[in-house]
């Protein structure tokens, strides 16, 4: 059964700034990645970023960069301007569309006692929701 | 258009150390991950490691490690490889590679000979 | 790190042939996996990307297929262009390893 992890992470470097992490575990061939945040796409998330094997990347303020770091998985910088986008406690989701299995998502979070710069290992989280 | 120039054919003595470029035109190399890889006569490749450019954070093969040190300068939109204490070992092809706007190898450079014979 | 072993390391065909190469990872990675092509002289190219995808530009003779620890890729109808080296890769995880190569040449 494919998996999706979500990891959030804040940078040690800049406070301000935050790395979602996702990935995908699975058979099948990735077609896009949509990354949003305040809950899953389509169900009251906000789009932060699409990435297309084929056609590259897109990503809306206040995401910096979406990149993929290999075949199935991708990551999204953001820069936090302050209280108007509290990060710390955003919840952040990952959907995956691959052929032939379909879309599968899953959401995570910036652990409450994380420390800057650290967090465990990208582990397979419960999918939330797959179409 | 994009392109990855790297630096011309170097030949460097055993123990020496050298740096090889990778210049990037077309796009923002903090936009991907510059990865560099190895490539001895008839033989295969080998992956070095990769650079997220934006911080400096690197990853690299553990049989690279102390060998070799990517750097990236974003003001100038060059990556850079550093390999010490060369040996004959070290004499190959190098080339750079981005990643990270599509999940694959897209653009890789010309590559650079490096020769270690004394 | 995972090893991608490649096999033959070497084709001999005549124009037209069919021709078969094999990669096998010592462990699952999935789709993660790429075929390139390396003309003499020249940089890779890549192939076909999530094991079965072609890449842009890429004619239809060259497919791949495979999923998990067992991975194929074909030209269905050899090309005199087709002379090169053919890399399997995985980036499934790091560090990322390529399989030894296979050189074809055409008769």
């Known amino acids: 059964t494919p998996e999706v992890w979500v990891q959030v992470q804040m940078e040690a470097t800049e406070l301000s700034s935050f790395t979602v992490h996702c990935g995908f575990l699975g058979p099948g061939s990735i077609s896009l990645v949509t990354v949003s945040w305040g809950g899953p796409d389509g169900a009251g998330g906000t789009k932060l970023a699409v990435l297309h094997p084929e056609l590259g990347t897109r990503q809306w303020a206040p995401a910096r960069q979406a990149r993929w770091e290999t075949q199935s998985s991708i990551s999204l910088a953001l820069e936090d301007s302050g209280a108007s986008s509290p990060f710390a406690n955003t919840t952040f989701c990952c959907k995956f569309a691959s052929f032939p299995e379909g879309s599968w998502e899953s959401c995570g979070s910036l652990p409450p006692s994380s420390d800057p710069g650290l967090s465990a290992p990208p582990t397979p989280v419960p999918i939330l929701r797959a179409d | 258009e994009v392109q990855l120039q790297q630096s011309g054919a170097e030949l460097v003595k055993p123990g020496a150390s050298v740096k090889l470029s990778c210049t990037a035109s077309?796009?923002?190399?903090?936009?991907?991950?510059m990865h560099w890889l190895k490539q001895r006569p008839e033989q295969g490749l080998e992956w070095i490691g990769r650079i997220d450019p934006t911080n400096g954070n690197s990853e690299y093969d553990p049989r690279f490690r102390g060998k070799a040190t990517l750097t990236a300068d974003t003001s100038s939109n060059i990556a850079y490889l550093q390999l010490s204490s060369l040996t004959s070992e070290d004499t190959a092809v190098y080339y750079c590679?981005?990643?990270?706007?599509?999940?694959?190898?897209?653009?890789w450079g010309q590559g650079t000979t490096l020769t270690v014979s004394s | 790190g995972i090893v991608m072993t490649q096999t033959p390391k070497f084709l001999l065909v005549s124009a037209g042939d069919r021709v078969t190469i094999t990669c096998k990872a010592s462990q699952s990675v999935n789709k993660a996996v790429v075929w390139y092509q390396q003309k003499p002289g020249q940089s890779p190219k890549l192939l076909i990307s999530?094991?079965?995808n072609r890449y842009t530009g890429v004619p239809d003779r060259f497919t791949g297929s495979g999923y998990g620890t067992d991975f194929t890729f074909s030209i269905s109808t050899v090309q005199a262009e087709d002379l090169a080296v053919y890399f399997c890769?995985?980036?499934?995880?790091?560090?990322?390893?390529f399989g030894g190569g296979t050189k074809l040449e055409i008769k």
């Open positions: 590679a981005r990643f990270g706007i599509y999940p694959y190898f897209d653009y």
């Open positions: 999530y094991a079965s």
């Open positions: 077309g796009f923002n190399i903090k936009d991907i991950y």
């Open positions: 890769q995985q980036d499934y995880s790091s560090p990322w390893t």
